[in-house]
């Protein structure tokens, strides 16, 4: 008997997610089953279903399938979080590119290559034809979408709405053209799910037909989603295990992105005249080892055979026979032209002196014209002319191109926090440069701090789910967990982003952290139904001295009755003195039998000058700080509350106006609390959210 193919590989999985139909006309079919694989097989074959199955949900608790004629992109449908559900969507319906001839393409492109609108398949006007949906079951001849029901050479096509042009192919790109990677693809997180010979990839969470060690839960940072090609182990390019029992694994055909840049988070500083660190970024032209023996060309196998070729190490600049350090050795080296000496170090290259001279900027640095071209984390800046499209995306005026020369640090968008640059690193698209404000420069970056000139609230109203004030009131509160224990608070400001404090991250290993959302009890007791537990995929540190971090979640939070986002204030706004605000946290309460429930302390806004007086003049507040005093003596934020928000309401809208950071004592009587002023950093927050890629839900 022929073994039935396992079709679950044709679906994109979204864990802990279900689909709710808002449109009652949409149909659903359910049945008890044992595994998600069984649901997938039935969905793919449409067996016994009164509709074309586009997605299904597997209910793990009830062992039940829910098959849908729609997916998360359909109208009349919304996504919802649910611990016991896993959503699987047929990739053919969500893909916007074709594989091979595009026979399986089921996307929604409905315009031909020359721009003519397609004729619906069920219509005979203007062209009569025999391609009826009823004659081509399973080929999804829906609406007027481009299709290739017979698998013809040119790819998906349609009859056109122009009586003069009977049919034409549609311009849908090959998936292998759409997908691209940098370097050897270690940071590639695209959707290629078949190998270069066309074999379908095996799901990373499956052990058949090939058993392997790359379990998604063991390697949460490797992007082992569904059955997409990945490079977790430093191969020359992404690969996957295949569904062919006789081919364990194979490389995938993913082209190199046009602007090919290094993609490691620890990208070395590029130098040409000297060695910085171990010289991994050395790009000079020294081509002899320390004693003068010439180097062998990297692309040659004579006199020494090796695999350190330019093809295998794409981002290491293995040009000509120049000294390089592609493998993390202690300094640049090369193979030598002497058959008796395989390798030698180029230790004659001097070490760099890292001092940049006394570079500084005035105001916010919009007129800075220095020649520093390196970010604060040591990444080399990328050329401005390669990034103009991205720049236009987040500024609404024409930047002064005469200032944007080479790859020097600049401030074309009037950023309040100084010069910055693009990096060419997909994980860190841009960052600030390590330049300080000039000594004695007192130019304020925001004016009129203590006068309510700009309102903090945007004009929209506070949302209350179903008209009932539920715990949505605190749905944006996040418990940051460090090695399974609560360490700090945080605020969910966007589905994938949490605003918190820099000091909340003692370890550099992101696997040490988790974010808990939707909870009221710090231990999650009684919150099982509403709790969402998310891994952390990246930390974006705020401008120098801000003490802020934007923490990127590994997948977006699902907004529901228990999890919601909180608004940000307008940039540079001030909230009137005596405005009533609240701080929230699971921190130290002073009680011996603390119950672990989220606490709130009510504070009121105090002007910076008055605040300084309360601190007996020992503290001078600046434009990046906000002060709030307790209504009740001795109440206020403390250990465990750090990272959490100071929440204020204006025009019926709640927003996070401050972030609790260490350093100002613990709820000291008569000493108002000093918080990081979020309004001062609002533009930075928006810029990060706009420019950093987040995983799709």
């Amino acid at each position: 008997q022929r073994k039935r193919r396992n079709t679950i590989h044709e679906f994109k999985k979204s864990a802990k997610t279900t689909l709710i139909k808002i449109d009652p006309a949409l149909k659903i079919k359910t049945k008890k089953v044992n595994t998600a694989d069984q649901c997938a097989n039935r969905c793919t074959r449409n067996k016994g279903l009164p509709f074309t199955c586009k997605a299904f949900v597997f209910d793990k608790a009830r062992k039940q399938c829910l098959w849908f004629p729609f997916n998360s992109m359909s109208s009349g449908v919304k996504k919802e979080f649910g611990h016991e559900f896993d959503l699987y969507e047929n990739k053919d319906y969500i893909r916007n590119c074709i594989i091979g001839k595009g026979r399986s393409y089921k996307g929604t492109v409905s315009i031909t290559k020359s721009g003519i609108k397609c004729q619906p398949w069920s219509s005979m006007i203007p062209h009569e034809h025999s391609f009826l949906p009823s004659s081509y079951r399973g080929k999804d001849l829906q609406e007027n979408y481009c299709r290739n029901p017979r698998g013809e050479e040119g790819g998906p096509w349609c009859f056109t709405s122009n009586p003069e042009v009977r049919y034409e192919v549609c311009d849908i790109p090959q998936c292998s053209e759409v997908e691209c990677m940098t370097c050897n693809g270690e940071s590639y997180r695209g959707l290629m799910d078949h190998t270069e010979s066309g074999k379908i990839c095996q799901r990373w969470d499956h052990q058949t037909p090939h058993r392997h060690k790359f379990l998604p839960e063991r390697y949460p940072d490797k992007g082992f989603d569904d059955n997409y090609c990945r490079n977790p182990d430093g191969q020359p390019r992404p690969w996957c295990y295949t569904l062919d029992p006789h081919t364990r694994w194979e490389y995938c055909a993913i082209k190199t992105c046009a602007d090919n840049t290094m993609n490691d988070t620890d990208v070395p500083l590029e130098t040409t005249e000297c060695i910085q660190g171990q010289g991994e970024g050395y790009r000079g032209t020294v081509n002899t080892i320390w004693n003068g023996i010439p180097c062998q060309r990297w692309d040659s196998q004579y006199p020494h055979e090796h695999d350190m070729t330019p093809e295998n190490f794409k981002c290491k600049d293995l040009r000509e026979n120049y000294c390089r350090n592609p493998d993390g050795s202690e300094s640049p080296w090369c193979f030598t032209t002497d058959p008796n000496i395989r390798v030698g170090y180029c230790s004659q290259i001097p070490n760099c002196d890292m001092s940049h001279g006394q570079d500084c900027y005035r105001g916010n640095g919009k007129n800075y014209m220095g020649n520093l071209s390196q970010t604060r984390s040591g990444l080399t800046c990328s050329m401005w002319d390669k990034n103009m499209e991205d720049l236009h995306r987040h500024i609404f005026w024409e930047p002064d191109a005469s200032k944007l020369n080479e790859n020097y640090c600049r401030n074309p968008d009037d950023d309040a926090h100084g010069p910055w640059c693009y990096t060419g690193n997909p994980l860190i698209p841009w960052d600030y440069c390590p330049i300080s404000r000039c000594e004695g420069d007192t130019t304020p970056t925001i004016v009129n701090l203590d006068h309510p000139v700009i309102s903090c609230a945007k004009t929209k109203q506070l949302r209350v789910v179903n008209g009932i004030p539920t715990r949505t009131n605190i749905g944006w509160m996040v418990s940051l967990r460090y090695r399974n224990k609560h360490i700090c608070g945080g605020s969910l400001i966007k589905e994938s982003w949490v605003l918190t404090a820099r000091q909340c991250f003692p370890s550099r290993d992101l696997k040490d952290y988790e974010a808990w959302l939707g909870i009221h009890d710090v231990h999650g007791r009684g919150d099982e139904k509403c709790k969402q537990v998310l891994n952390v995929s990246q930390l974006v540190y705020g401008p120098e001295g801000s003490d802020l971090v934007l923490m990127k979640l590994a997948r977006p939070a699902v907004l529901d009755d228990f999890v919601s986002t909180i608004d940000l204030p307008n940039y540079g706004c001030t909230i009137p003195e005596k405005t009533s605000c609240s701080v929230y946290g699971w921190g130290y309460t002073g009680l011996i039998n603390y119950d672990g429930l989220l606490r709130v302390a009510h504070l009121y806004i105090m002007g910076n000058e008055k605040c300084s007086q309360h601190h007996r003049g020992k503290v001078t507040l600046n434009e990046s700080e906000i002060c709030a005093g307790a209504e009740k003596i001795g109440s206020g934020p403390c250990e465990g509350d750090y990272g959490g928000p100071l929440v204020c309401e204006q025009h019926k809208m709640r927003m996070v106006l401050g972030v609790i950071v260490p350093g100002r004592g613990c709820a000291i009587p008569n000493r108002p609390g000093i918080f990081v002023r979020v309004a001062y950093y609002a533009k930075w927050i928006h810029k990060i959210i706009l420019t950093y890629k987040v995983p799709q839900s």
Partner: antibody
Framework: SLEESGGRLVTPGGSLTLTCTVS????????ISWVRQAPEKGLEWIAV?????ATDYASWAKGRFTISRTSTTVDLKMTSLTTEDTATYFC?????????????WGPGTLVTVSS | AYDMTQTPASVEVAVGGTVTIKCQVS??????LSWYQKKPGQRPKLLIY???TLASGVSSRFKGSGSGTEFTLTISGVECADAATYYC????????????FGGGTEVVVK
């Protein structure tokens, strides 16, 4: 500066609390760690208390050692002491607020566990 | 766990010579590694942090290199005052760690 105190002779099974007194160091900006060195042995990390109040311990120190702080001191409480715990105990300032390198050390205090 | 293995345990070197000490970590720590010098009866002294950055006031004869899992401390032009025990320490994470320090390398100057 940092200065350890509280080291003395203690009998096996006993308890002892060491204190690290800091001056000119802001505990809301720097983590503090305890490290020890037994006679003729290497440096051994014990525990750290971070700026946000969270703590970490070497796997062997969990349960028997407790690190805590006030605004100017960091204590290390040691229980069920054995002769293996005989060592010079150092407190050290950790660079910045989290786990990092130790850029300032105290002179050490000697703990002797013996019957 | 981030296990630290330091080699050799002891090394003898002549004045003016060069000594190389290796430190291997069981999993990658990027460049989050520090080196310390410890003399009997004295407190440890920070030499190098972030794998290759020289601490303030430390002679440039001390050089740190490496990243990932393999690191090296090189002392060139060795002087009598360099006789001490040298330790590496990982500054990446203390999740399930037995010891953040390597076992130490004793440098004996002849």
């Amino acid at each position: 500066s940092l200065e350890e105190s509280g080291g003395r002779l203690v009998t096996p099974g006993g308890s002892l609390t060491l204190t690290c007194t800091v001056s000119g160091i802001d505990l809301s900006s720097n983590a503090i760690s305890w490290v020890r060195q037994a006679p003729e042995k290497g440096l051994e990390w014990i525990a750290v208390i971070y700026v946000v109040g969270a703590t970490d311990y070497a796997s062997w120190a969990k349960g028997r050692f407790t690190i805590s702080r006030t605004s100017t001191t960091v204590d290390l409480k040691m229980t069920s002491l054995t002769t293996e715990d005989t060592a010079t105990y150092f407190c050290a300032r950790v660079y910045d607020s989290g786990w990092n390198h130790f850029n300032l050390w105290g002179p050490g205090t000697l703990v002797t566990v013996s019957s | 766990a981030y296990d630290m293995t330091q080699t050799p345990a002891s090394v003898e070197v002549a004045v003016g010579g060069t000594v190389t000490i290796k430190c291997q970590v069981s999993q990658s720590i990027s460049s989050w590694l520090s080196w310390y010098q410890k003399k009997p009866g004295q407190r440890p002294k920070l030499l190098i942090y972030r794998a290759s950055t020289l601490a303030s006031g430390v002679s440039s004869r001390f050089k740190g290199s490496g990243s990932g899992t393999e690191f090296t401390l090189t002392i060139s032009g060795v002087e009598c005052a360099d006789a001490a025990t040298y330790y590496c320490q990982q500054a990446y994470s203390v999740s399930n760690v037995d010891n953040a320090f390597g076992g130490g390398t004793e440098v004996v100057v002849k």
